[in-house]
Amino acid sequence: GAPEGGQPYPVLRVAHSAPVGAQLATELSIAEGQEVLFGVFVTGKDGGPGVGPNSVVCAFPIDLLDTLIDEGVERCCESPVHPGLRRGLDFFQSPSFCPNPPGLEALSPNTSCRHFPLLVSSSFSRVDLFNGLLGPVQVTALYVTRLDNVTVAHMGTMDGRILQVELVRSLNYLLYVSNFSLGDSGQPVQRDVSRLGDHLLFASGDQVFQVPIQGPGCRHFLTCGRCLRAWHFMGCGWCGNMCGQQKECPGSWQQDHCPPKLTEFHPHSGPLRGSTRLTLCGSNFYLHPSGLVPEGTHQVTVGQSPCRPLPKDSSKLRPVPRKDFVEEFECELEPLGTQAVGPTNVSLTVTNMPPGKHFRVDGTSVLRGFSFMEPVLIAVQPLFGPRAGGTCLTLEGQSLSVGTSRAVLVNGTECLLARVSEGQLLCATPPGATVASVPLSLQVGGAQVPGSWTFQYREDPVVLSISPNCGYINSHITICGQHLTSAWHLVLSFHDGLRAVESRCERQLPEQQLCRLPEYVVRDPQGWVAGNLSARGDGAAGFTLPGFRFLPPPHPPSANLVPLKPEEHAIKFEYIGLGAVADCVGINVTVGGESCQHEFRGDMVVCPLPPSLQLGQDGAPLQVCVDGECHILGRVVRPGPDGVPQST
Amino acid sequence: EDWQCPRTPYAASRDFDVKYVVPSFSAGGLVQAMVTYEGDRNESAVFVAIRNRLHVLGPDLKSVQSLATGPAGDPGCQTCAACGPGPHGPPGDTDTKVLVLDPALPALVSCGSSLQGRCFLHDLEPQGTAVHLAAPACLFSAHHNRPDDCPDCVASPLGTRVTVVEQGQASYFYVASSLDAAVAASFSPRSVSIRRLKADASGFAPGFVALSVLPKHLVSYSIEYVHSFHTGAFVYFLTVQPASVTDDPSALHTRLARLSATEPELGDYRELVLDCRFAP
């Protein structure tokens, strides 16, 4: 009875007492048939949601309640009485301490402490039987019955539904007898429920509904397995394609067997030559948790071809929570020589199965949608790479993803697959022993795909230097080294200590590559970020330049006229961030096509005019080339005395 | 490529949107109370109370009989007429607050919000598999009832729970009513009481035992009686009430009250706090 942890649900909404069935009695550690008080509790008067479910159900065995009350009386009335223990019920009677009667007077010899009302000092604590699984449901009515050895809670809800649920504490899901709507009004089901024979009467709005205790029917069970696993008292049987009671389909009703049911299979295609490991999904395959299949009971065919059952790999067996139901069956498909390319059916037939706990499995299930295909390899790129391996090969073709296994072999060694799609395979080459041309092949389902390809192992690229040691987004970086073109791409990466950004260098010269810096945002427009700039080619060892400075990109000003005063022989213009990158990239300033020996003063650029320069009537274009990218910033003009431009 | 079957949720094996049509009865108004009766000779009935009316249904939910229980003061009120001529209190609608079976007789007892919360006794008359109600008896003796002491004032307009217990040849009504100051001032219903039905069905015996919320707490301390039942040697009431008379009245908890079903007295009235929790 001591309070426990957890979220309190202090407000009782509805209650009912009933004798319990064997299973729940065991869980409550009481005898079967003992009376238990069941209550639906909420967090507050409005019943609104807090964290956790809207309604919870607690079970209080009556004998335990009585024992707790009697113990409370003993604590109050038998000496030694704990000092300060109150009799309670101060709203009904005068306050007093045990063992005194209400009021101030002490016990007289002919009155007993036990002859006065008492609030027992300890409470009786219980946790939600449903473990929070009622979730958003707001229960408004409750009636508990015992059916066979099962205890069933019949609950009405705020939205006018009836939930008939087995009362068990040990599961992580609700075992429904039914869950249905009483009508279209959606009005709350009222608190008082009555029983009449094998029916319960619920009221909702202005209506009274008569609900069978064993549930309204079986049609809500969608699968044969679920149907025949229903409680015996529900009287459910399988009628070919639906679950029903015998009166609903007397001709086809049976409780004896279920056919297997294929719901899905994988893969949906396989090679015409070579094997495929086919996984069938569904229910009622073998009803054995270990996945053992009795000999000769399961026959799988795909088109004309048989699929040989495989023993379940025990390492792959995963515990299936009963709330999820799915069975897996694996078989090895080896197409017959007569098998044609194209779509076909997957068929599972189960016969001669021993009966299970609820039913035996017997029958056939067919599912469309498997296709036999012929993989074709059309192109491989690149056909060379460093001896170190790590080259990302792209194999292009058709039906490359069919089946369950494929391998790209480079000189007999597997090329590790990184991506598989119908038209493309990507894999990383293994290291090669020497510089040589070696065979490259593709196997699907263990069979070789036609075509003859060779891969050339080349000397490993060696990066010797990276320059300059600074730059900005997309600015050029020169990588020098040897055999740089042995790799399909060099990768340039900048790491600031927290994150890395990459760009791919275009394959150019064997000893020199011009790359562009990757996308990297320098937050502070006045600052820069130091980090490591690395270059690597496929799986070969890379080169790292520490202390690389990543700068914000310079921003050219908007183009306009640059008027010169008569006495001026140099032009000044602002170019934000240009001075900062002067050490990192080539900068060329020309006026009228002639170069000027520019200088930087902060963000100002000073360009002395070449003596040979002739400024015509329209002036001369001022062009700045930064890292090979040129912008015309405006035209240099010399205004006349009246402000009109004039030539010099 | 270790592909595994996608887990089919357990819920996919059933469809709770399937429509089921179950027998029903339209009462013509919001159902206020309902009780069922099953006799020894295969006769059964469902009694359904709505405002100002009591329906008697057969086991097939077809209407067998209908009785006007209000409005009080209305000439068509069939139960009111059982109390004789003359005004018996302020006129008004009758909301049924109590609808119980007295298994000893057997009889149906209904008590409403009108006429000081008095009750009416309807003897059950089997007719084949159905049941009819005999003419109602008014469980109210005017000369026994005063505003400060009214054994026949049973039902509170705020809600009343009743459990009937047979002790020897007598029927005892274990009554629990929600009170406030206004209700308490009119014909003094009690919070918890045990009342013996008089043998002549003229009302309840005076001098009954009772507990009531003390006048000083009536304004702030309200008790809602959610459920009552009888099992073994006890009658139990379940309440929702403030956790303390002194603290915040909106801080509620649930209690179980236990009364002896064998001794019609309240000395061994006990309460126990029921604590229900969700432990994720």
Epitope: T485, E506, R507, L509, P510, E511, L514 | -
Partner: antibody, heavy 117, light 106 residues
């Protein structure tokens, strides 16, 4: 079989611009780079620039301001554009495919360009 | 820029004579490639990666060298070998050619 075919004007007036097209077959411009080389009459070979498979260009710095190389992968065509031609730009202009091992393996037949008024 | 110098602009040799022409680089290069150009035709790749003969090149030709010094050798001159031979480096920007050595028949 790899082939490079060139087309362009024979005669260009001084200060005018030159445009030559090199159409390739037998390989894809998305896989290989194409270079331009010229040879003045009776003289040696001079590398002008390149457009790589991904579209990156590199130029001989002496000619950078006047030179532009572009391409249309879908048409398998590479374009050379040179501005402000002078008489010393008179030469045979070749396009050549590059093997990535550091050499040109296949050359176009060349386009004769004469700069004269 | 890497400057390739072919010191002998013109050389002549009699049929059957051994011919060696040189190419020196202003800074070290890993490989040198040789092109043969006959009058009014496009250059042809003749020797690549310093010593490997291009497809269709007679076996009397050979190439050697490393670092700054490279050479092309014809073990036995033949009339069809009359052409201009250019050395070339294509490993670093800007790509550069030697001025060429014109080989004539004596």
């Amino acid at each position: 079989q790899v082939k490079l075919q060139q087309s362009g004007p024979g005669l260009v007036a001084p200060s005018q611009s030159l445009s030559i097209t090199c159409t390739v077959s037998g390989f894809s411009l998305t896989s290989y780079g194409v270079h331009w080389v010229r040879q003045p009459p009776g003289k040696g070979l001079e590398w002008l620039g390149v457009i790589w498979a991904g579209g990156t260009t590199n130029y001989n710095s002496a000619l950078m301001s006047r030179l532009s190389i572009s391409k249309d992968n879908s048409k398998s065509q590479v374009f050379l554009k040179m501005n402000s031609l002078q008489t010393d730009d008179t030469a045979m202009y070749y396009c050549a495919s590059y093997d990535y091992d550091g050499y040109f393996d296949v050359w176009g037949a060349g386009t004769t360009v004469t700069v004269s008024s | 820029d890497i400057v390739l110098t072919q010191t002998t602009a013109i050389m002549s040799a009699s049929p059957g004579e051994k011919v060696t022409m040189t190419c020196s680089a202003s800074s070290s290069v890993s490989y040198i490639h040789w092109y043969q150009q006959k009058s009014s035709t496009s250059p042809k790749l003749w020797i690549y990666d310093t010593s490997k003969l291009a497809s269709g090149v007679p076996g009397r030709f050979s190439g050697s060298g490393s670092g700054n010094s490279y050479s092309l050798t014809i073990s036995s001159m033949e009339a069809e070998d009359v052409a201009t031979y250019y050395c070339f480096q294509g490993n670093k920007y800007p790509l550069t050619f030697g001025a060429g050595t014109k080989l004539e028949l004596k």
